[in-house]
């Protein structure tokens, strides 16, 4: 499991991980599947009209520590979860938008799902 700043990977992690991608598919992706040395993610964001938008894709290993931790953004809501335990694991990620009143929710732990171990900080 991956907590703040720590990057201990599960032993079962594939060297090349395949992830479902939606709105974040690179040019070389086929059938909405991308490949990475890092993590799969699913992200939920709120658009200007308040509509939730769910997207998914691949994250490279470099920089995944700050990508997989919800980082503050002003005046909008966003939440991301990451996984590595198997190919297309992000199909089973279901991040939820933080409550409107609590904008600083994002200072919490990395949202990371391993072997059905789920960290939620909402």
């Amino acid at each position: 499991k991956k907590e703040d700043g720590e990057s201990t990977a599960p032993t079962a992690r594939p060297k090349v991980l395949r992830c479902k991608c939606h709105h974040h598919c690179p040019e070389d992706s086929v059938n909405n599947i991308c490949s990475t040395d890092g993590y799969c993610f699913t992200m939920i964001e709120e658009d200007d009209s308040g509509t939730p938008v769910v997207t998914s894709g691949c994250l490279g290993l470099e920089g995944s520590d700050f990508q997989c931790r919800d980082t503050p953004i002003p005046h909008q809501r966003r939440s991301i979860e990451c996984c590595t335990e198997r190919n297309e694991c992000n199909k089973d990620l279901h991040p939820t938008l933080p409550p409107l009143k609590d904008r600083d929710f994002v200072d919490g732990p990395i949202h990371h799902k391993h072997h059905h171990h789920h960290h939620h900080h909402h």
Epitope: H23, H24, E46, D48, V53, C58, T71, P72
Partner: antibody, heavy 124, light 107 residues
């Protein structure tokens, strides 16, 4: 690793237009906002605007709305900024900078990776 | 637009010193304050985001603090490679704006 390649310099005549390029590599181009920043000689930095390569959505600094037009070519992972009706005031270094965070619709304000900058000289 | 003010435009310090660079916003920016380093050759690096979070690869001698309208960047044990101009930037409100920069020089 993330790389943003910009031409070193451009020389153009007053009244003309120029299209500056920023070729991205080392990441999924369509997933991150790309920002453009201006720096006049010996001066500070000015944010011009941003574009999301996947949607083509843009946000401009009001001061540059009639001056700059941001576009992307997804197939070549290249961002462009066209500057029109050039004057000596437009002579500056122009940087592209990729945002820190993956985003689809939200706007995020972190300029994490910078190109080397293009020196634009407007002179007859 | 939010004005960002770096009152000290240049600063002289000795190697090994602790240096603090200040930045003030014209209104509350809710900790959406970032710091950048520009080397003499023009290269710009992202150092600190959201007031105090170090970007990956940035040495731990850099730190950031502040809240509301007042923010600062501290460099402990100043090294030769830290000689540069430092800019703050607010990310709370469009258009994003930068401070005028603080040029750090060696005594």
């Amino acid at each position: 690793q993330v790389q943003l390649q910009q031409p070193g310099a451009e020389l153009v005549k007053p009244g003309a237009s120029v299209k500056l390029s920023c070729k991205a590599s080392g990441y999924t181009f369509i997933s991150y906002w790309m920002h453009w920043v201006k720096q006049r000689p010996g001066q500070g930095l000015e944010w011009i605007g941003m574009i999301h390569p996947n949607s083509g959505s843009t946000n401009y600094n009001e001061s540059f709305k009639s001056k700059a037009t941001l576009t992307v070519d997804k197939s070549s992972s290249t961002a462009y900024m066209q500057l029109s009706s050039l004057t000596s005031e437009d002579s500056a270094v122009y940087y592209c900078a990729r945002d820190l965070l993956i985003a689809t619709v939200v706007v995020t304000p972190y300029f994490a990776y910078w190109g080397q900058g293009t020196i634009l000289t407007v002179s007859s | 637009d939010i004005q960002m003010t770096q009152t000290t435009s240049s600063l002289s310090a000795s190697l090994g010193d602790r240096v603090t660079i200040s930045c003030r916003a014209s209104q509350d920016i809710s900790n959406f304050l970032n710091w950048y380093q520009q080397k003499p050759d023009g290269t710009i690096k992202f150092l600190i985001y959201y007031t105090s979070r170090l970007h990956s690869g940035v040495p731990s001698r850099f730190s950031g603090s502040g809240s509301g309208t007042d923010y600062s960047l501290t460099i402990r044990n100043l090294e030769q490679e830290d000689i540069a101009t430092y800019f703050c930037q607010q990310g709370n409100t469009l258009p994003y704006t930068f401070g005028g920069g603080t040029k750090l020089e060696i005594k």
